[in-house]
Amino acid sequence: SEVEYRAEVGQNAYLPCFYTPAAPGNLVPVCWGKGACPVFECGNVVLRTDERDVNYWTSRYWLNGDFRKGDVSLTIENVTLADSGIYCCRIQIPGIMNDEKFNLKLVIKPAKVTPAPTRQRDFTAAFPRMLTTRGHGPAETQTLGSLPDINLTQISTLANELRDSRLANDLRDSGATIRIG
């Protein structure tokens, strides 16, 4: 029974995983892998940390939070449908059979062709200006009247990033968290 997380194609996906270090800087090795957690380590490792730093990573996978404070949540950049599946976060706490493992299910949805109303509201809340658009010639390139130097692609990306950051904060409360020591 994995906890399920969602993202759209082209977005950054966020998979939460946390622990509380016994003391500041007293880090615990962590691995992230694609596929359910096996008995040992992670299968198909995409990122790994030791007691000091990230010591192995692959492209598009990174730790956006402060892993030195125990935030080992995984960010997957620019996801595709192939990124769907189970991911394993394993916190390798020293001792006999002490490590904690969490299976998180990532569901990737196709990108929406047109922005949903909720996304428009999100952006309006972040930028409370009149969002009128005007066409420019046959190509119908659309820009915001009040922000003439920002195109819709940039706005959509910005809106996604804003939403991602809010989502990250929301998920922090529901993510896998353990306390050590």
């Epitope: 096996p38 008995v39 198909n44 007691e51």
Partner: antibody, heavy 125, light 108 residues
Framework: EVQLVESGGGLVRPGGSLKLSCAAS????????MHWVRQAPEKGLDWIAY?????????????YYADTVKGRFTISRDNAKNTLFLQMTSLRSEDTAMYYC?????????????WGQGTSVTVSS | QIVLTQSPAIMSASPGKKVTLTCSAS???????LYWYQQKPGSSPKLWIY???NLASGVPARFSGSGSGTSYSLTISSMEAEDAASYFC?????????FGGGTKLEIK
């Protein structure tokens, strides 16, 4: 070339102790988890213990044991000396076997990809 | 714990014949964590197949692996003398990791 060489086996009385060693070379030992697996004469393979990489200090390792050896065997490692250990106490006749150390590959195979040649342990009075 | 049952325990095959060894699990095993090892008398085991169907380095292409859930198999498309050995399946999907009892494959 990856090499694992076990030593320390021999004949021991029931209730006795023995410490096995596994010297590793040809790879960054501190970066890999390690296993001990045994094989009784003419029998199958029996996993007994695992220790995670503990890449900076051996005290940082996560350890797993088979129920059959829990409380009697202790797995440890010395990353500075590229050596894996298995301290065996309260030995029983059923512990008689060839003992192998094996590397746990996490980079692609997720398996015990290299094994030593083994060291023989005989528990008999 | 997951019990892996291999069959047959012993079998012999003529050169050129197709051989299939089976490994049955008492409960479901993730195909990513199902392996086969080859062992010859007096030698240590060698990783032969990993993640159900991937051949380890140096393993001849006549070998293949397949399966899912509780049923797995190793197949040799055309038996050769050097294939005579014991083959063990192994799972590390759930604790404790376990091995099958092995199949001893002999050449006729």
């Amino acid at each position: 070339e990856v090499q694992l060489v076990e030593s320390g086996g021999g004949l021991v009385r029931p209730g006795g102790s023995l410490k096995l060693s596994c010297a590793a070379s040809g790879f960054t030992f501190s970066d890999y988890g390690m296993h001990w697996v045994r094989q009784a004469p003419e029998k199958g393979l029996d996993w007994i213990a695992y220790i995670s990489s503990g890449s900076i200090s051996s005290g940082s390792s996560t350890i797993y044991y088979a129920d059959t050896v829990k409380g009697r065997f202790t797995i440890s490692r010395d990353n500075a000396k590229n050596t894996l250990f298995l301290q065996m106490t309260s030995l029983r006749s059923e512990d008689t076997a060839m003992y192998y150390c094996a590397r746990h590959d996490w980079r692609g195979l997720y398996a015990m990809d290299y094994w030593g040649q083994g060291t023989s342990v005989t528990v008999s009075s | 714990q997951i019990v892996l049952t291999q069959s047959p325990a012993i079998m012999s095959a003529s050169p050129g014949k197709k051989v299939t060894l089976t490994c049955s699990a008492s409960s479901s095993v993730s195909s990513s964590y199902l392996y086969w090892y080859q062992q010859k008398p007096g030698s240590s085991p060698k990783l032969w197949i990993y993640s159900t169907s991937n051949l380890a380095s140096g393993v001849p292409a006549r070998f293949s692996g397949s399966g899912s859930g509780t049923s797995y198999s190793l197949t040799i498309s055309s038996m050769e003398a050097e294939d005579a050995a014991s083959y063990f399946c192994h799972q590390s999907s759930s604790y404790p990791p376990t091995f099958g009892g092995g199949t001893k494959l002999e050449i006729k």
